[in-house]
Interface confidence: low
């Protein structure tokens, strides 16, 4: 007996061939001997089966001795043995229809779980293997679960159902809703304008929700809400913003915030959360601000940084075009009685300069100039 696998909602064509290459009488029946369709001369006739409106054949092939049964919009319950009667012969075809669906919405938040459920006909024992867009294979029976979805899981999942050495392939498009970057860090000199950007890693027709930026300043004992906003069809509108600092927010995506100037009291870490309409859970992006200040008071030239710096970062003070006078893995360095010239304060990571502030030290009879 021939086995054919079909996909729920698809169309399948079961073949039946006579030895005579001409139009002769044929009938297709199901396992209960109920007629599905056949011919009367050049006319197609249909029986009382439940497939009535979904069954068809190809009259153009009859003259060649081919009498296919076409079943449209397949259902799991169409799984059955179909019998083609032609020239006193019976050709049997077993049709097995499978369906594979995502348990919920195919738009899932980063960190959520994806469950794929296989619908299969009674008596079948299929195996399923799915390949994620990043090439990860998962295997299972009636259900497959993937916990902690990551951004790289966005895209087309290809699932293969195997039964009786035959296979059928399903493709399911999954969108993982997340920010492009889980965390970002901005390095600024005191007084500079700060730009925070929160690009999303997905695009959808309509995007509605609300968000908030909570900020934990390094100098503060508790965090505070700097801004809350609404998102309606990709348009951003500010609901509430603190007076200090007075953030500005772009009206369009990507979410974009501007802090008029970097000050030591603002240095710290923020967490932008975005709650999307009809979704449980929130998207998160961490943002960090490091602020540098170089000052000269009397005979002391000081360079300080505030904010979340890693212990491996190096803070240095050097006279331009000379070796570093002082270099430490600390948040403040200083030089007593600095000689006149352009001094550079550098925050670096393995030789890569992340932040630089210049201060001009004038001969002792004049005051310092900050460029």
């Amino acid at each position: 007996k021939k086995v054919v696998l079909g996909k729920k909602g698809d169309t399948v064509e079961l073949t039946c061939t006579a030895s005579q290459k001409k139009s002769i009488q044929f009938h297709w029946k199901n396992s209960n001997q109920i007629k599905i369709l056949g011919n009367q001369g050049s006319f197609l006739t249909k029986g009382p089966s439940k497939l009535n409106d979904r069954a068809d054949s190809r009259r153009s092939l009859w003259d060649q001795g081919n009498f296919p049964l076409i079943i449209k919009n397949l259902k799991i319950e169409d799984s059955d043995t179909y019998i083609c009667e032609v020239e006193d012969q019976k050709e049997e075809v077993q049709l097995l229809v499978f369906g594979l669906t995502a348990n919920s919405d195919t738009h899932l938040l980063q960190g959520q779980s994806l469950t794929l459920t296989l619908e299969s006909p009674p008596g079948s024992s299929p195996s399923v293997q799915c390949r994620s867009p990043r090439g990860k294979n998962i295997q299972g029976g009636k259900t497959l679960s993937v916990s902690q979805l990551e951004l790289q899981d966005s895209g087309t999942w290809t699932c293969t159902v195997l039964q009786n050495q035959k296979k059928v392939e399903f493709k399911i498009d999954i969108v993982v809703l997340a920010f492009q970057k889980a965390s970002s860090i901005v390095y600024k000199k005191e007084g500079e304008q700060v730009e925070f950007s929160f690009p999303l890693a997905f695009t959808v027709e309509k995007l509605t929700g609300s968000g908030e930026l909570w900020w934990q300043a390094e100098r503060a004992s508790s965090s505070k809400s700097w801004i809350t906003f609404d998102l309606k069809n990709k348009e951003v509108s500010v609901k509430r913003v603190t007076q200090d600092p007075k953030l500005q927010m772009g009206k369009k995506l990507p979410l974009h915030l501007t802090l008029p100037q970097a000050l030591p009291q603002y240095a710290g870490s923020g967490n932008l959360t975005l709650a999307l309409e009809a979704k449980t859970g929130k998207l998160h992006q961490e943002v960090n601000l490091v602020v540098m200040r170089a000052t000269q008071l009397q005979k002391n030239l000081t360079c300080e940084v505030w904010g979340p710096t890693s212990p491996k970062l190096m803070l240095s003070l050097k006279l331009e075009n000379k070796e570093a006078k002082v270099s430490k893995r600390e948040k403040a360095v200083w030089v007593l009685n600095p000689e006149a010239g352009m001094w550079q304060c550098l925050l670096s990571d393995s030789g890569q300069v992340l932040l630089e502030s210049n201060i001009k030290v004038l001969p002792t009879w004049s005051t310092p100039v900050q460029p």
């Epitope: 990043r134 970057k181 730009e195 690009p199």
Partner: antibody, heavy 119, light 107 residues
Framework: QVQLVQSGAEVKKPGASVKVSCKAS????????ISWVRQAPGQGLEWMGR????????GYAQKFQGRVTMTRDTSTSTVYMELSSLRSEDTAVYYC????????????WGQGTTVTVSS | DIQMTQSPSSLSASVGDRVTITCRAS??????LNWYQQKPGKAPKLLIY???TLQSGVPSRFSGSGSGTDFTLTISSLQPEDFATYYC?????????FGGGTKLEIK
């Protein structure tokens, strides 16, 4: 100063797999991601993906999804890039590079490993 | 994916010349742009990161500028060792993408 030392040249037949290693020395292995970049003869640079040696998390370019696997061995400070189902157009020099993370640059590179795919 | 377009693809110049190479991104990448130099048979070398910051140890004749979609690498006075191929690369979002390269040759 961090150095990345790669394994030697390889010659492979179409359909085979190749595994290139990249060993870090002179620095903290898990502090940075390692990106893999390839360059076909006479062509430009093409980013294949990156691995975070700390967490083992990977991110691959769509073009290589399903064919590339990046792994790490923290005990030897080594990352590996395996490319399967090789074809002649995979003939290239494969570089590993220290990648300071998204938004940053690749500041330390391995010397490159030549992979030749020929029947 | 973000496409990076470099121009010109090749350039002939003389020692002492001022040379400018441009790079254009298919969408705004703010200042997430790096420049690399590559000599035949060698690995690329980082020159400039974050569009305009000179990598430690790179001569000051190299400078970078630009933000958004248009970027420039300038060599103020070409030296014999500067003849090489130069690549721009965006690091705004994965997949990281490179420009097609600019081959700088001796006139």
């Amino acid at each position: 100063q961090v150095q990345l030392v790669q394994s030697g040249a390889e010659v492979k037949k179409p359909g085979a797999s190749v595994k290139v290693s990249c060993k870090a020395s002179g620095g903290t292995f898990s502090s940075y991601a390692i990106s893999w970049v390839r360059q076909a003869p006479g062509q430009g640079l093409e980013w294949m993906g990156r691995i975070n040696p700390n967490s083992g998390n990977t991110g691959y370019a769509q073009k290589f999804q399903g064919r590339v696997t990046m792994t790490r061995d923290t005990s030897t400070s080594t990352v590996y890039m395996e490319l399967s189902s090789l074809r002649s157009e995979d003939t290239a020099v494969y570089y590993c590079a220290r990648d300071i993370g998204e938004g940053y640059s690749m500041d330390v590179w391995g010397q490159g490993t030549t992979v030749t795919v020929s029947s | 994916d973000i496409q990076m377009t470099q121009s010109p693809s090749s350039l002939s110049a003389s020692v002492g010349d001022r040379v400018t190479i441009t790079c254009r991104a298919s969408q705004s990448i703010r200042t997430y742009l790096n420049w690399y130099q590559q000599k035949p048979g060698k690995a690329p070398k980082l020159l400039i990161y974050a569009a305009s910051t000179l990598q430690s140890g790179v001569p000051s004749r190299f400078s970078g500028s630009g933000s958004g979609t248009d970027f420039t690498l300038t060599i103020s006075s070409l030296q014999p060792e500067d003849f090489a191929t130069y690549y721009c690369q965006q690091s705004y979002s994965a997949p990281l993408t490179f420009g097609g390269g600019t081959k700088l040759e001796i006139k």
